[in-house]
């Protein structure tokens, strides 16, 4: 099985124990590590941060002691914006220039492939996204002709039904991608006005349309029905939780909220907590399991957080094995307890290790 793990370059800027550099990563933990994100400027792939090249080097030296490890560079992301991707993909010359710039950049900096993180193609971009993938793959095949190992091509796709329908021609893009990471998280957010888990495995008992689509099981099944081969589908598992501020004394699933949860000490983003911050939060909190959805949530005071723990990730891995998927994807290594100092287990990357162990279990 593949264990595809994302590392985010901005994690270096978190304070104190939250600061994560690629040399803190475990070289034997994941089969693939994806560096997020690269930029595109002047229609060429480019660094996002000035120090990216240093971090590329730190990441890719992990392969010195584990030659089986593959590293990919993810291009795009939320801050890049869909419009900029759209302009490049829809213009033949811009697309060509971008595609041509990718192999030398990846080779120079020691990457084994490219991950496309166009979040998200619009309805009018659907065909252009397919063309971009098809032409990128053709370029990778051509570039590898002189006996080089062919560069890998992957894409991170939304798990939301509406986005899947409008953005992707699943059957066509699947032909050209080496694997597809389906982002089976962020199904529920503060915009809903109520508490809810952002990455449930199954549909909740109370879920009515459109909530019946907002779970991992539906998204995976839908992708498979649309023509994604199970052998290329990698299922996303988050090492972060989504938090809410409760608006009343109600604390269960579906309780009213006044907004996102308070920012974490290190991640400093309202409504999001890294797993290592959740471990802190759990001291003195009340933990519940949403039985049908097979995921936990915790409450403390007026704060509510839905997250994944070692038990829920094992359930998810068993599910993806039952579905004969290619493996699991983790967003993100730097949100797991990468130091092993927060979650009281004396184990670095406890969630990712639990996923790895479950994948290896017979």
């Amino acid at each position: 099985y593949k264990l595809v793990c994302y590392y985010t370059s901005w994690s270096q800027y978190r304070e104190g124990d939250g600061s994560c550099f690629p040399d803190a990563l475990d070289r034997f933990l994941c089969t693939h590590i994806i560096y997020s994100f690269a930029n595109i400027s002047n229609d060429h792939i480019d660094t996002w941060e000035w120090n990216d090249v240093t971090l590329y080097g730190m990441l890719n030296t992990l392969k010195n002691r584990n030659p089986n490890l593959k590293t990919l560079l993810s291009v795009g992301g939320w801050n890049f914006g869909s419009q900029r991707f759209s302009k490049i993909a829809s213009n033949t010359q811009s697309r060509r220039t971008f595609i041509k710039s990718v192999p030398p950049f990846l080779r120079t900096h020691g990457f084994d492939g490219l991950d496309l993180a166009w979040l998200y193609p619009g309805r009018r971009d659907k065909q252009h996204f397919t063309t971009l993938i098809k032409e990128m793959k053709a370029e990778f095949i051509k570039e590898a002709q002189p006996g080089k190992k062919q560069l890998l091509l992957s894409a991170a796709l939304s798990a939301g039904k509406v986005t899947i329908d409008s953005s992707y021609d699943i059957a066509k893009i699947s032909q050209h991608l080496d694997f597809i990471s389906i982002m089976t998280y962020d199904f529920h957010g503060a915009w809903r006005g109520t508490t809810g888990h952002h990455s449930p495995l199954f549909r909740g008992q109370e879920d009515a349309s459109p909530d019946r689509f907002s779970n991992t099981d539906y998204a995976v099944g839908y992708m498979l029905r649309l023509g994604a081969p199970a052998s290329k589908l990698v299922m996303g598992i988050p090492t972060f939780g989504r938090s809410f501020t409760l608006a009343s004394s109600e604390t269960g699933v579906g309780a009213p909220i006044s907004g996102p949860g308070i920012p974490g000490r290190f991640t400093k983003e309202a409504g999001t907590l890294a797993y290592y911050e959740i471990c802190d939060f759990l001291r003195g909190a009340t933990v519940h399991r949403i039985l049908g959805q097979q995921v936990p949530y915790a409450t403390k005071g007026n704060q509510w957080v839905g997250y994944d723990d070692q038990e829920s990730v094992k359930s998810k891995v068993q599910y993806l094995k039952d579905r004969q998927l290619a493996g699991a994807m983790v967003w993100a290594l730097d949100l797991d307890d990468f130091q092993g100092s927060f979650c009281g287990q004396d184990l670095r990357f406890p969630l990712t290790n639990a996923i790895k162990d479950a994948l290896a279990a017979t």
Epitope: S41, N42, H44, I45, D46, W50, P104, F105, T108
Partner: antibody, heavy 117, light 107 residues
Framework: EVQLVESGGGLVQPGGSLRLSCAAS????????MSWVRQAPGKGLEWVSA????????YYADSVKGRFTISRDNSKNTLYLQMNSLRAEDTAVYYC??????????WGQGTLVTVSS | DIQMTQSPSSLSASVGDRVTITCRAS??????LNWYQQKPGKAPKLLIY???RLQSGVPSRFSGSGSGTDFTLTISSLQPEDFATYYC?????????FGQGTKVEIK
């Protein structure tokens, strides 16, 4: 083997202009950011400017902003520094450097710029 | 701008000595500190990047440590070719700034 060769330095009057060039070889030029760093006679190092591999991002020290322009021609593997409205305090050896991220892992031999009347 | 302060500004040492140079940033720069060596009439040479990572080809007697605001360059056993001026540089945010330099002279 990485090589960086600067040229274009010389004597120029205050208010004048000069264009420095840096010819690069031995690495995939377009995949790396590049920098200019200067050193006034007997003084320490001062970072001047930097440009990303695709030319999409440029940065300048406050002391040269609005007067100096960094650029590159990836088809010629060449980095440039256009220096206008030169002042006496711009007198220095100008080094072109390949950026390994934000450190400069290879440097040219430098070219001397003297601003004097 | 982030100010970088090196100390001492100069030092005298003998071959075989352990030499330590410190660099302090005016604000936290995480691990984004580089160390360079410069000999008279020559271009600077990168020794250490990202506070503690040894640049390829640099002898292992050079080491760097620190994070946040306080950093150290250590030469474990000074060799004749190490007599030079050493500069620290922060690369956390532009403008990237250098320390004023530390000249290591023969005692």
């Amino acid at each position: 083997e990485v090589q960086l060769v600067e040229s274009g330095g010389g004597l120029v009057q205050p208010g004048g202009s000069l264009r420095l060039s840096c010819a690069a070889s031995g690495f995939t030029f377009s995949s790396y950011a590049m920098s200019w760093v200067r050193q006034a006679p007997g003084k320490g190092l001062e970072w001047v400017s930097a440009i990303s591999g695709s030319s999409g991002s440029t940065y300048y020290a406050d002391s040269v902003k609005g007067r100096f322009t960094i650029s590159r021609d990836n088809s010629k593997n060449t980095l440039y520094l256009q220096m206008n409205s030169l002042r006496a305090e711009d007198t220095a050896v100008y080094y072109c450097a390949k950026a390994q991220g934000t450190s400069a892992d290879f440097w040219g031999q430098g070219t001397l710029v003297t601003v004097s009347s | 701008d982030i100010q970088m302060t090196q100390s001492p500004s100069s030092l005298s040492a003998s071959v075989g000595d352990r030499v330590t140079i410190t660099c302090r940033a005016s604000q936290s720069i995480s691990r984004w500190l580089n160390w360079y060596q410069q000999k008279p009439g020559k271009a600077p040479k990168l020794l250490i990047y990202a506070a503690s990572r040894l640049q390829s080809g640099v002898p292992s007697r050079f080491s760097g440590s620190g994070s946040g605001t306080d950093f150290t360059l250590t030469i474990s056993s000074l060799q004749p070719e190490d007599f030079a001026t050493y500069y620290c540089q922060q690369s956390y945010s532009t403008p990237w700034t250098f320390g004023q330099g530390t000249k290591v002279e023969i005692k």
